[in-house]
Interface confidence: medium
Amino acid sequence: FKVTTPYSLYVCPEGQNATLTCRILGPVSKGHDVTIYKTWYLSSRGEVQMCSERRPIRNLTFQDLHLHHGGHQAANTSHDLAQRHGLESASDHHGNFSITMRNLTLLDSGLYCCLVVEIRHHHSEHRVHGAMELQVQTGKDAPSNCVVYPSSSQDSENITAA
């Protein structure tokens, strides 16, 4: 499977809400011995590879923001914690998963990475990520709502397998 990012750039005004989205394409293993883990984190455009560094989003680490399987939160405390920070991660059964950030500030600008790990117990781990940029703007040049820029076909598939 691979992860695509429908939009590579989100330009949003301060105070607005933004939902960043990733999509899993292709077959994902199913069964008792398979765990699908999804999460989000901030990163930087590394020289070697995008999304290698993992930084917190609003002080929440990628561990705090993770989802298991088809969107079941691993722990309610994690979910509550995210909501207290104006964040919510969600997942559907069509391969889409997202993070919603409420009341954006300039500090939210950065490179956001979604991570999917397929754990085939007793066998291997397959890791894939996608990246997108969020620019939060203020002042007269800021858009009234979020403006999204579609990924080019090349950029939309950020594949890293482990």
């Epitope: 999460t39 290698s52 561990q63 722990a75 991570l115 890293t160 397998a161 482990a162």
Partner: antibody, heavy 118, light 106 residues
């Protein structure tokens, strides 16, 4: 503060079994896998296996299947490893360590020393 | 299983000296992880995903590599860096560690 507190040292007789505990605090227990690692003078570090408190799923190093049994008690945020039919080769320090999926073992217990001797 | 071979097994360095140790994998792995262990203590995570420093790790440590060849470098050796260093892979089961490089201070 993240902590993994393991049970104390053990001196056991050959053929006996024993259980080591690892009490987790300071983080969401179900958001990580709990891994167990053996350290002996002969083999350095060896990964024994992991358990996911989220769903109880386990993965073992084939070498330790039948030797180690991993369980968790979610209510007390405690992971356990039972070691069966002990021999002198099982004398070692055993560590528990938490791991987030797609990451590394970022916090370790202090280790439990097990000595098998008659 | 993937065998990780570390070299050298033992090395010594003077304060301020640059130190490099290597980890060779029997099959290709996607990422390498490095741990530091001092006598009487538990292992401590140093490097994740080949080249990223774990929280609280001094900037003099760095990691690099790909495929079957990886390395850990200390730009300027300090007395507190004397320890045993282990590489580890999570790419395929069973997860394995290298045999360790013991770094001593001259």
């Amino acid at each position: 503060e993240v902590q993994l507190q393991q049970s104390g040292p053990e001196l056991v007789k050959p053929g006996a079994s024993m259980k080591i505990s690892c009490k987790a605090s300071g983080f969401s227990f179900t958001g990580y896998t709990m891994n167990w690692v053996k350290q002996s003078h002969v083999k350095n570090l060896e990964w024994i296996g992991l358990i996911s408190p989220y769903n109880g799923g386990t993965s073992y190093n084939q070498k330790f299947k039948g030797k180690a049994t991993l369980t968790v008690d979610k209510s007390s945020s405690t992971a356990y490893m039972e070691l069966l039919s002990l021999t002198s080769e099982d004398s070692a320090v055993y560590y528990c360590a938490r791991r987030a999926y797609g990451y590394a073992m970022d916090y370790w217990g202090q280790g439990t020393s097990v000595t098998v001797s008659s | 299983q993937i065998v990780l071979t570390q070299s050298p097994a033992i090395m010594s360095a003077s304060p301020g000296e640059k130190v490099t140790m290597t980890c060779s994998a029997s099959s290709s792995v996607s990422y390498m992880y490095w741990y530091q262990q001092k006598p009487g203590s538990s292992p401590r995570l140093l490097i994740y995903d080949t080249s990223n420093l774990a929280s609280g790790v001094p900037l003099r440590f760095s990691g690099s590599g790909s495929g079957t060849s990886y390395s850990l470098t200390i730009s300027r050796m300090e007395a507190e860096d004397a320890a045993t260093y282990y590489c580890q892979q999570w790419s395929s089961y069973p997860f394995t560690f290298g045999s360790g490089t013991k770094l001593e201070i001259k």
